[in-house]
Structure formats: structure tokens, C-alpha cells
Interface confidence: medium
């Protein structure tokens, strides 16, 4: 178990030109917060995908009121770490996704607004027990400068938060099999701590996260009797040789706890040990209030003045989820119509259409020839959604109208005269070379140089030229 | 029932060599931690040894680490301690014992003991 | 390692009476990250093997009587027999399996 631990320096604008509008006004003050999403691997996972290892939310920062005809400066930010707990291993590659949002402060009905400000993702290598990694990404014209690192929680050590350390019992030795925990070293290694609700009683482990049963029982975290179904005693221990290991209904049969928690049996019933943030019998009641600002993507929050109230978030156009945390991916129905670009706005969708089509979503075939005539005989040619002309000799260009002058380009090597001609350029060659752009030097023997072979090709072998 | 028989014990000279087994039945054998716990005549219980359900993890106490050997033999569900260079102080009843469950645990079962006695 | 001092070494008392054997830890034998107290009770009676009493602090074994009973946390543990049985005269170990494996010296609960 452990803590990513992100500490946001400055969000402000990145270099170069086209500074960013100040997010706040005079009109319109507001404040940032952050969002930070881990998830487990080097994964290219879509933004919406849950946040495996954990997420977290900033505190709100100061009110921001934009200084007329000023720059937007880096804007304040709140105090504090964003912790992201962990309780398993560390896994030493990680996606992220950071989040800066608006919380605009005007007079708004139902409270205040939300907007996505920017959002930058990267892929990391981080071993935990690290120092703090620096980081500087860029979301379109703003610039986020942060440092992370991630922390094993005692008793945990290692680069995986896997090694389980105590202060040792003695100054020179730690106990049998417990090896010292370097650079801790007046630590010692300490018991794996099992599978969260592994039963004390009948489950036990030999490696972190693990759960094994005693004989008689059974489950995921052994809370489960095995019965006798031919056997004498219906719910007492069976030997492993009789043959009649039959799971046994047990209270915890199919996991009653919802939103992650573990279940334990108790002696009359079952017993839920609740994630942070829920509570209930079976811990289905969740503890976040829109106090706690839990719609993202500008979701609107009703409800949930208490805890014991849920609240429910209105999602905009183009978001979904219990949380408006998952961006609507419209664009996968392929909407834009002859190979227009589909551009996923928030707000709108928007089809870029390719040359030779037009409407909302490119259904419209424009005639490119209609109406555009080519100059000096040239003839209009259509395909693929874009026009182009045939030119007659000597002419060139888009619409046929430049002369073309097949000697501007100089194709004549080595100091040769180029000719216009009807039938398109001749070189006269300087003496001493030859060939159709004078590109061969004549020897003095009269053979001529001609270019080496390229590999794989023997002299003589005439696609050389080609 | 779960038994755990101890046997090898006996009288050896100081720097000699003995090998204790303990045969176990009664339970999955392969499923649990095992240690061997010793105690001198009139006196308390020390741990000496044990090791883990697939033999892969073994644990001493400092005072016979480095002569003795902690070993099974799953297939044929037998314990068995390595005790070499012995010294007068290793007199004692060794008992074989089972954990609850892995290394982590109480030990929850004994066998009756074999008695070691080191002496010129 | 962790040293376990056992008070008294010997307890007289009679049939019928309360028993109540302490067992100190020169350090904590609780577990943060599971909240167990990674300590047991044996009873060893002469020319026997030990028994499983306690584990856990608190947990009796399977076929303990409920008069056995242990409470505690941390460095201080008690082993409480609520009413003392003819059979219960024995001696005592208390045990832990924290950090190393080490015992207490052990209470006799003898006959008075």
C-alpha cells in the first residue's frame, strides 16, 4: 500500500504566441482545481476509462479576477498535495491524465459552473520510494508544470510497496526470515498482510494479496463452509479423502457488498467493510455530497445536501456516467459522411469535409466542374471530390491559365542549352557530356561514365537507369 | 485426526550429526507451515526452525543458524530438521509442530516429541 | 528479538477460582496493517506436548472451553481462566509470532 503524491507548480500560459485568454473576468470570477487519474501500465487507455489505480481531486484554489487588458498570468492554485492512495503493489508503469478546471463563481442558478479547462496525459515509469519526479506538459496554449512521486505507507517498502517493514526488535538482526529493510536500516521485514477480508480464522497467505483456505472452507476470502453433501455431519470439517467437498451455502455466497467492499461472515450474518466513501449494511450508500463537487465535465449536481441523501448529476451534451465522467464518443458512430474528419466539440460535432463536399455532415456531392471552365482548352476532370484540370500543351496550372515554360526549371546539367519545343524540351549539351539533361561526361576515349551499379544489381543490367 | 510422529532422536557426541523426521497425517500436509520447537529438560519452549507450505522460504532461529537444516518432503508428507556441529546446549525435546496456516500463524498442532541429547 | 516476560512465574490457587496470568512484550505485538495481535496462549502439561489455547490474542482454538479467554493489545496481554478445573493445573506459555517466533518463560498454575 502506498501514495502518488502530485504537487501542482504553475498553470498559466505555455510559450510562444497565441497566449490563452484568462479563464476569469471581472465579470466572471472563478477558480481552478485539479484532477488527477492513474491508471496501472503504459496502457494508451481513452481518457474515459476507469481510473484503475485510483483518482483525486484538488481542493478549489483562490478567486481569480482577470486584471483588465493584462496576460493571463500563471493562475493561483490550491494549496496542498493531490494524494492518489494505493492499496495494492505499486506497479512501476503508469498512465496519467491531469485534469485543470474552472469553477466559475457568478451569479449561475443552481450554483457554480464547471468547465474542462485542459488536459494533459503521459505515460511514466516511477518506482516508489523515489524522489519527486519534474514534469512540464502542454494542453493547446496552456502549460502545466507538476512533480510526482509515490510512497510506500508503512509498514510497506520497496520499489513495489510489496516488502512489508517494522522497526526491528533488536539493533543487529531482524527475525528468522525477515530480512533488514535497506534503506531502513533499523527495519525489518514483516508479515505479508493478506487478501482485504481474507478470514483470519480459515484463510491465510503466503504472498501479499493472498488468500488461502484451511481445510473445511472455501470462497474467495474462505468465508465459505465446505458442507458434506453424503457425509455424516452436514456443515462440520470433511476430510480430504472422503470425497465430499461441496460448497456450502454461506452468507457471503456472491459478495452482498457493493462498491468494493469485502465481506466478512459474522456468526448470525455477513459483515461489509466499506470502501472511503460509502457505508451501508451492504455499503451501498455513498458518502459525497455535491459539496464535494463529484460531477465532472461541467455536470450539474442535484440532490445529496446530506450524506444520507444520493445526489445525481446532470451530464451535458456529450458526457455520461453516474459522474459525467465519461466523454460520449459520437464520433465512433462515423457521422461525417465521404471521408469528412469527425471533430468531437463538447458542445457540437462538427464534420470537416473533404475538397468537392459540404453540409453538416458532408452529404452533399459538389459538381466541381459545374460552373468552372479551364482556360486555354483545357478540359475539367472530376474525382474524388476535387477538381482538377487537363491542360492543353504549354499550358499549366490549377485553372490552365499559366504558360508554361518547360526551361524555367533549368533541366539541362553542366552548362547545357535548353530549347522550348512543341513536343516539350531538348537540351543542347556543352562538350564533353551527353545524354537527354546532359548528365553524362564524355571520356576521353570516347566510353562514357555511366553511374554505378546500385546493390544488388550487376553492371550491364539495364534497370539501372530506370 | 491430525498426528504428527516425531522420530531420529537419540544420544550424539558434541560436533555430531542428527536427523530428525516427523511423519504427518490427518491433513492436507502440502497446504501448511511447519516449525520444529525444543525444550531443554525443565525448562521453556524455543523455536527452533521452519518453513513454508512448498518448502521454498526457510527460517531459523540465531541460535542454529547455519548447522541446522529445515527440510519436506510433500510427497511423502514428512518434516524433517538437519542437525549438524552439535552442542551440549541443543539437548532438548524436539517436537514437530503444524502452523494454522502459512509461516504467519499460530502453531496449532504437536507432535509428542523425540529427545536429543548431546553429550561426550 | 522480542522478549516475553510472563508474571507470575507461579500462581496458587484452588478449584473454582479465577485465574489471571499477564504476559508483557518488550515491543508491540500488533500488526497496523491488519489491526491483529500476532500473539497465542499454549498450556503444556508435564511429559505432554503444548495445546493451543489462544491465537490471535483473543481467538479461542477449536475445543477450548469458553472459560479460557484472552484480552489485550499491543505489549500487554492477559490470559483469563474464569473458574479453574482440575485439568487446567499446568503451566502456561504465552507466545509471539510477529517478529521471530519467541515464547515467555511460562506461568504454573499449581494447586493450592
Known amino acids: 500500500a502506498g501514495v502518488f503524491e502530485l504537487q501542482i507548480h504553475s498553470f498559466g500560459p505555455g510559450p510562444g504566441p497565441g497566449a490563452p485568454r484568462s479563464p476569469c473576468s471581472a465579470r466572471l470570477p472563478c477558480r481552478l482545481f485539479f484532477r488527477v487519474c492513474l491508471k496501472p501500465g503504459l496502457s494508451e487507455e481513452a481518457a474515459e476509462s476507469p481510473c484503475a489505480l485510483g483518482a483525486a481531486l484538488s481542493a478549489r484554489g483562490p478567486v481569480y479576477t482577470e486584471q483588465p487588458g493584462a496576460p493571463a498570468p500563471d493562475l493561483p492554485l490550491p494549496d496542498g498535495l493531490l494524494q492518489v492512495p494505493f492499496r495494492d503493489a505499486w506497479p512501476g508503469t503508469f498512465s496519467f491524465i491531469i485534469e485543470t478546471w474552472r469553477e466559475e463563481l457568478g451569479d449561475q442558478i443552481g450554483g457554480p459552473a464547471w468547465s474542462l479547462l485542459a488536459r494533459v496525459a503521459g505515460r511514466r515509469r516511477l518506482a516508489a520510494g523515489g524522489p519527486w519526479a519534474r514534469d512540464i506538459q502542454r494542453a493547446g496554449a496552456w502549460e502545466l508544470r507538476f512533480s510526482y512521486r509515490a510512497r510506500c505507507e508503512p509498514p510497506a517498502v520497496g520499489t513495489a510497496c510489496t516488502r512489508l517493514c517494522r522497526p526491528r526488535s533488536a539493533p543487529s538482526r531482524c527475525g528468522p526470515g525477515l530480512r533488514p529493510c535497506a534503506p531502513l536500516e533499523d527495519e525489518c521485514e514483516a508479515p505479508l498482510v493478506c487478501r482485504a477480508g481474507c478470514s483470519p480464522e480459515h484463510g491465510f497467505c503466503e504472498q501479499p494479496g493472498e488468500c488461502r483456505c484451511l481445510e473445511g472452507w472455501t470462497g474467495p476470502l474462505c468465508t465459505v463452509p465446505v458442507s458434506t453433501s453424503s457425509c455424516l455431519s452436514p456443515r462440520g470439517p470433511s476430510s480430504a479423502t472422503t470425497g465430499c467437498l461441496v460448497p456450502g451455502p454461506g452468507p457471503c455466497d456472491g459478495n452482498p457488498c457493493a462498491n468494493g467492499g469485502s465481506c466478512s461472515e459474522t456468526p448470525r450474518s455477513f459483515e461489509c467493510t466499506c470502501p472511503r466513501g460509502f457505508y451501508g449494511l451492504r455499503c451501498e450508500v455513498s458518502g459525497v455530497t455535491c459539496a464535494d463537487g463529484p460531477c465532472f465535465n461541467g455536470g450539474l449536481c442535484v440532490g445529496g445536501a446530506d450524506p444520507d441523501s444520493a445526489y445525481i448529476c446532470h451530464c451535458p451534451p456529450g458526457f455520461q456516467g453516474s459522474n459525467c465522467e465519461k466523454r460520449v464518443d459520437r464520433c465512433s458512430l462515423q457521422p461525417c459522411r465521404n471521408g469528412g474528419l469527425c471533430l468531437d466539440l463538447g458542445h457540437a460535432l462538427r464534420c470537416r469535409c473533404r475538397a468537392g463536399f459540404a453540409g453538416p455532415r458532408c452529404e452533399h456531392d459538389l459538381d466541381d466542374c459545374a460552373g468552372r471552365a479551364c482556360a486555354n482548352g483545357g478540359t475539367c476532370v472530376e474525382g474524388g471530390g476535387a477538381h482538377r484540370c487537363s491542360c492543353a500543351l504549354g499550358f499549366g496550372g490549377r485553372d490552365c491559365r499559366e504558360r508554361a515554360d518547360p526551361c524555367a526549371a533549368r533541366p539541362c546539367a553542366h552548362g547545357g542549352r535548353c530549347y522550348a519545343h512543341f513536343s516539350g524540351l531538348v537540351c543542347a549539351c556543352a562538350p564533353g557530356y551527353m545524354g537527354a539533361r546532359c548528365e553524362f561526361p564524355v571520356h576521353p576515349d570516347g566510353a562514357s561514365a555511366l553511374p554505378a551499379a546500385p546493390p544488388g544489381l550487376r553492371p550491364g543490367d539495364p534497370q539501372r537507369y530506370l | 485426526e491430525v498426528q504428527l510422529l516425531e522420530s531420529g532422536g537419540g544420544l550424539v557426541q558434541p560436533g555430531g550429526s542428527l536427523r530428525l523426521s516427523c511423519a504427518a497425517s490427518g491433513f492436507t500436509f502440502s497446504s501448511y507451515a511447519m516449525s520444529w520447537v525444543r525444550q531443554a529438560p525443565g525448562k521453556g519452549l524455543e523455536w527452533v526452525a521452519a518453513i513454508n507450505s512448498n518448502g521454498g522460504n526457510t527460517y531459523y532461529a540465531d541460535s542454529v543458524k547455519g548447522r541446522f537444516t529445515i527440510s519436506r518432503d510433500n510427497s511423502k508428507n514428512t518434516l524433517y530438521l538437519q542437525m549438524n556441529s552439535l552442542r551440549a546446549e541443543d539437548t532438548a525435546v524436539y517436537y514437530c509442530?503444524?502452523?494454522?496456516?502459512?509461516?504467519?500463524?499460530?502453531?496449532?498442532?504437536w507432535g509428542q516429541g523425540t529427545l536429543v541429547t548431546v553429550s561426550s | 528479538d522480542i522478549v516475553l516476560t510472563q508474571s507470575p512465574a507461579t500462581l496458587s490457587l484452588s478449584p473454582g477460582e479465577r485465574a489471571t496470568l499477564s504476559c508483557r512484550s518488550s515491543?508491540?505485538?500488533?500488526?497496523?496493517?491488519?489491526?491483529?495481535?500476532?500473539l497465542a496462549w499454549y498450556q503444556q502439561k508435564p511429559g505432554q506436548a503444548p495445546r493451543l489455547l489462544i491465537y490471535w490474542a483473543s481467538s479461542r482454538a477449536t475445543g477450548v472451553p469458553a472459560r479460557f479467554s484472552g484480552s489485550g493489545s499491543g505489549t500487554d496481554f492477559t490470559l483469563t481462566i474464569s473458574s479453574l478445573e482440575p485439568e487446567d493445573f499446568a503451566t502456561y506459555y504465552c507466545?509471539?509470532?510477529?517478529?521471530?517466533?519467541?515464547f515467555g518463560q511460562g506461568t504454573k498454575v499449581e494447586i493450592k
Open positions: 509442530a503444524r502452523h494454522r496456516g502459512g509461516f504467519y500463524y499460530a502453531v496449532d498442532y
Open positions: 507466545h509471539q509470532y510477529l517478529s521471530s517466533r519467541t
Open positions: 515491543q508491540s505485538v500488533l500488526y497496523s496493517s491488519n489491526q491483529k495481535n500476532y
